[in-house]
């Protein structure tokens, strides 16, 4: 039994870690597997992490965290059985994926704007609380076509835009994820997505 | 309002123990991390110890490693430092703070401890 | 370890001189580094931390900035109540370590 591809492993920068790996041939990665991490130069325990199977040879393991800092560092050591198949180190706050952000809701009783509002995933002593920007995903669920996004770089979780930008008596959908560039993270998985119905007034002609 | 108080500090010969204690009002410790950081005269500032919210991580400086212990009483809403074997370079003044992401937000107002013979 | 020196080490400035301070780390830490003031015989007081947020009741004419190996801390127009000693601490890694310090004094 050997790994095949070394894992790799992002952080929420909050309790979980989760890592992933390819080992050479089928594997149940929960009963002939286990991850043990310890961190460096604190005193504390070494944890075990039972894997899932995740593709045919693939594993995953979800590694509960206490409340990750940003000096963190862990050994990791991938077993099977007495075996000591690879052994690494990970530095959570090196490796961030944000969480989604959540309670995404669209507003339309705003005088002909359409406001978006979301909540940032963090807590507000988390590091990542006052860094996040965000990226709206907003579509037609009629035209394909008609999907756009909208870059968020202030820190309020929130958008404006003028309903008529839009098309008027057509079903859309939004959804948003977040990153935090200083600390150089990965994007978040986009959070759920919301539908409204778009109505606006049109504008009377002048003559 | 947030106020944390050290006390126990004192003169202490070389190998001799003192227990420090930081009792803490404004907020819950087991909510927060807790530090002990100390300053020697004149000198500056030194991060010797620290303990995580759930008490699971705990840190210390090599220079104090297994001779200083850091504990809390979370019904008592107060940290403590143990330190044993002391030394005259652990002359210093000994600072409580309430720690967030390894940033000292609070602080007390710090207690000297003097080791000498 | 990560060692922080801090430049310069005495600064004589006048009330509403613009004062900046560099802490330059020996080897890269993103924006994990904090600022702090202390005032004789008390305990040190956070300003910034996350390398550029300013702490909730700092005034503003303090401001940080920088990543990686070189930060800086600015004061806009200095205050008498600012003549103190100012540490960086790098929050990188494992020992945490202080800068030497800088002692802003009056001219």
């Known amino acids: 039994m050997k790994v095949l591809q070394e894992p790799t492993c992002v952080s929420d920068y909050m309790s979980i870690s989760t890592c992933e790996w390819k080992m050479n041939g089928p594997t149940n990665c929960s009963t002939e597997l286990r991850l043990l991490y310890q961190l460096v130069f604190l005193l504390s325990e070494a944890h075990t992490c039972i894997p899932e199977n995740n593709g045919g040879a693939g594993c995953v393991c979800h590694l509960l965290m206490d409340d990750v800092v940003s000096a963190d560092n862990y050994t990791l050591d991938l077993w099977a059985g007495q075996q000591l198949l690879w052994k690494g180190s990970f530095k959570p706050s090196e490796h961030v994926k944000p969480r989604a952000p959540g309670n995404l809701t669209v507003h339309t009783n705003v005088s002909d704007t359409l406001l978006l509002t979301w909540s940032n995933p963090y807590p507000p002593d988390n590091y990542l609380y006052n860094h996040l920007t965000y990226a709206v995903n907003i579509w037609s669920e009629n035209d394909p076509a008609d999907f756009r996004i909208y870059n968020v770089t202030y820190l309020e979780p929130s958008l404006r835009i003028a309903a008529s930008t839009l098309k008027s008596g057509i079903s859309y959908r939004a959804r948003v994820r977040a990153w935090a560039q200083c600390y150089n993270t990965t994007w978040s998985e986009w959070s759920p997505s919301t539908k409204w119905h778009n109505s606006y007034r049109e504008p009377f002609e002048q003559h | 309002q947030v106020q944390l108080v050290e006390s126990g500090g004192g003169l202490v010969q070389p190998g001799g123990s003192l227990r420090l204690s930081c009792a803490v009002s404004g907020f819950t410790i087991s909510d927060h991390y807790m530090s002990w950081i100390r300053q020697a005269p004149g000198k500056g500032l030194e991060w010797i110890s620290y303990?995580?919210?759930?008490?699971?991580?705990?840190y210390y400086a090599d220079s104090v490693k297994g001779r200083f212990t850091i504990s809390r009483d979370n019904a008592k809403n107060s940290l403590f430092l143990q330190m044993n074997s002391l030394r005259a370079e652990d002359t210093a003044v000994y600072y409580c703070?309430?720690?967030?992401?390894?940033?000292?937000?609070?602080w007390g107002q710090g207690t000297l401890v003097t080791v000498s013979s | 370890d990560i060692q922080l020196t801090q430049s310069p080490s005495f600064l004589s400035a006048s009330v509403g001189d613009r004062v900046t301070i560099t802490c330059w780390a020996s080897?890269?830490?993103?924006?994990?580094l904090a600022w702090y003031q202390q005032k004789p015989g008390k305990a040190p007081k956070l300003l910034i931390f996350?390398?550029?947020t300013l702490q909730s009741g700092v005034p503003s004419r303090f401001s940080g900035s920088g990543s990686g190996t070189e930060f800086t801390l600015t004061i806009s127009s200095l205050q008498p109540e600012d003549f103190a000693t100012y540490y960086c601490q790098q929050l990188n890694s494992y020992p945490l370590t202080f800068g030497g310090g800088t002692k802003v004094e009056i001219r």
């Open positions: 080897q890269g830490i993103s924006s994990y």
């Open positions: 996350a390398a550029s």
């Open positions: 303990i995580s919210s759930s008490g699971s991580k705990i």
């Open positions: 703070a309430r720690t967030r992401q390894l940033v000292g937000d609070y």
